[in-house]
């Protein structure tokens, strides 16, 4: 027997990516009202981090946010992408038919039909692979019927993607590899759908698109990547820095505001009219009353 | 759809021949395998033999090699069978049926009305 | 030559009952046997085929089971349009071999 198995190779996936800050650690913008005079000059030239004035307000590229574009979102949304697809690349041999000249065009009937048989023949095989979604023909050749292929897998994102797909990967190797084997032309009889020549299956590739959360994360945080870090909640990843609140990296500023430097996550201390608070979480309150007398 | 025509009667002498037709529709012609298969009344089926339309090549039931012979017009999408030095043994009705799939497949979901053969002096 | 033994030749039922028609090779056929409807005026209609894989467009109250030498068409449920001539055919090996016919009549 000739089934030979492949190395598996990596795409990555693109990610819608879009970046929240979280609504409940963001001052509120003030309403804008259009600028009259010579200040508006002043304001638009104060616009932060890449920020451009559209003559009413700072519009801040992405990762940033404020009335000036000076503060670091918190939450950055990476997706994920709701499935995540793999492609086996597939040749079998088909002994049932003969090879003519039409069937080099995909836009002949002959082809069309042929694809047909093969399609439902393949849907058969694999019917019991819930990752299962289809087959492509990419190319047929004689001797007998050469039919490359590819197997189209997909599956949800969970964390475990990978290993979902994998294990469908080599379903489909033992299921094409027992067909091939039984389904084969005995004195000159086809009693199945489809026969097929046992050694001719092969699998010349898998490739499988990659998503890493992680590597997304911090490439889209630029130059705070260091301190934005994934977590999972629900089987979905959020990528965000210490001061989104909730997650188990969250700082915990008290009276403070959390904000980001490119030094990392640092505690904003307010003063109320009692207390001054400090330390590196404000949980330091001094009581104005003991300083003033 | 699929279709497969053929003509509803022909009556012969004994010792001559016959050629029966059908002409299928709704398909490629060349793609797939035909079938005859003859029916006797109170003697069920027997299956004669199929021919590739797209090469010509032929498989025969061993008991009609010297009796029938396949043969096909791709232009006009017919398949024929001939029979000859016929007897009253051979007074049947003759249907042509069409495999399911692109290739070789020995069962038939579609078959033409059947052409009866009196043989008959 | 394949054989095919087909019991029995004659069956007589009601609309609503249950009814089994038997095929029998003289050697094993695997599970590669056919059965079709033959009904006068209308053109043969293949019922199951590979033993047990039911044409696509048949009501599923057809069935068929069995390899090896012995197999079995079950009709559950008989409808009026039911009554009919049924053949199996053996598509294991040449010449294709057909058995003798099951006559359905309304009884």
């Known amino acids: 027997r000739t089934t030979s198995f492949p190395t598996v190779t990596t795409t990555a996936v693109p990610t819608n990516t879009t970046i929240k800050s979280n609504p409940t650690s963001t001052p509120t913008v003030p309403r804008t009202t259009t600028c009259f005079g010579d200040g508006c000059q002043n304001t638009a030239s104060r616009c932060k981090n890449g920020g451009t004035w559209d003559g009413l307000k700072c519009q801040c590229p992405n990762l940033y946010y404020g009335e000036l574009c000076e503060e670091v979102v918190s939450s950055i949304d990476i997706g994920p992408p709701e499935t995540i697809s793999a492609q086996m690349e597939l040749t079998v041999t088909v002994t049932s038919v003969k090879f003519t000249e039409e069937l080099k065009n995909h836009s002949s009937q002959e082809f069309q039909e042929f694809k047909q048989t093969f399609t439902e023949q393949m849907n058969i095989v694999y019917s019991g692979i819930p990752e299962y979604v289809g087959v492509n023909i990419t190319k047929l050749r004689l001797g007998s019927v050469v039919v490359e292929h590819d197997v189209l897998l997909r599956t949800k994102y969970t964390p475990e993607y990978k290993t979902v797909l994998d294990n469908a990967t080599e379903v489909v190797k033992e299921k094409i590899t027992k067909v091939t084997t039984q389904q084969i032309m005995i004195n000159d009889i086809c009693s199945d759908m489809m026969c097929f020549n046992t050694t001719g299956t092969q699998v010349q590739n898998i490739t499988v698109t990659q998503y890493d959360p992680e590597e997304d994360c911090r490439k889209m945080a630029k130059e705070y990547g260091d301190y934005f870090v994934v977590e999972y909640r629900d089987q979905k990843p959020y990528c965000i820095s210490p001061c989104e609140p909730g997650f188990s990296v969250s700082k915990n500023c008290n009276l403070g505001k959390c904000q980001m430097s490119l030094s990392g996550p640092q505690c904003l201390c307010v003063t109320t009219e009692t207390h001054w608070y400090s330390g590196e979480t404000c949980n330091q309150g001094t009581q104005k009353s003991l300083v003033y007398g | 759809q699929v279709q497969l025509q053929q003509p509803g009667a022909e009556l012969v002498r004994p010792g001559a021949s016959v050629k029966l037709s059908c002409k299928a529709s709704?398909?490629?012609?060349?793609?797939?395998?035909m079938n005859w298969v003859k029916q006797r009344p109170e003697q069920g089926l027997e299956w004669i033999g199929r021919i590739d339309p797209y090469d010509s090549e032929t498989h025969y039931n061993q008991k009609f090699k010297d009796k029938a012979i396949l043969t096909v017009d791709k232009s006009s999408s017919t398949a024929y069978m001939q029979l000859s030095s016929l007897t009253s043994e051979d007074s049947a009705v003759y249907y042509c049926?069409?495999?399911?799939?692109?290739?070789?497949?020995?069962?038939?979901?579609?078959w033409g009305q059947g052409t009866l053969v009196t043989v008959s002096s | 030559d394949v054989q095919i033994t087909q019991s029995p030749s004659y069956l007589a039922a009601s609309p609503g009952e249950t009814i089994t028609i038997n095929c029998r090779a003289s050697k094993s056929i695997s599970k590669y046997l056919a059965w079709y409807q033959e009904k006068p005026g209308k053109t043969n209609k293949l019922l199951i085929y590979?033993?047990?894989t039911l044409q696509s467009g048949i009501p599923s109250r057809f069935s068929g089971s069995g390899s090896g030498t012995d197999f079995t068409l079950t009709i559950s449920s008989l409808e009026p349009e039911d009554f009919a001539m049924y053949y199996c055919q053996q598509h294991h090996e040449y010449p294709y071999t057909f058995g003798g016919g099951t006559k359905l009549e309304i009884k």
């Open positions: 590979s033993g047990s």
């Open positions: 709704g398909y490629t012609f060349t793609t797939y395998w």
């Open positions: 049926a069409r495999g399911p799939y692109y290739g070789t497949n020995p069962w038939f979901p579609y």
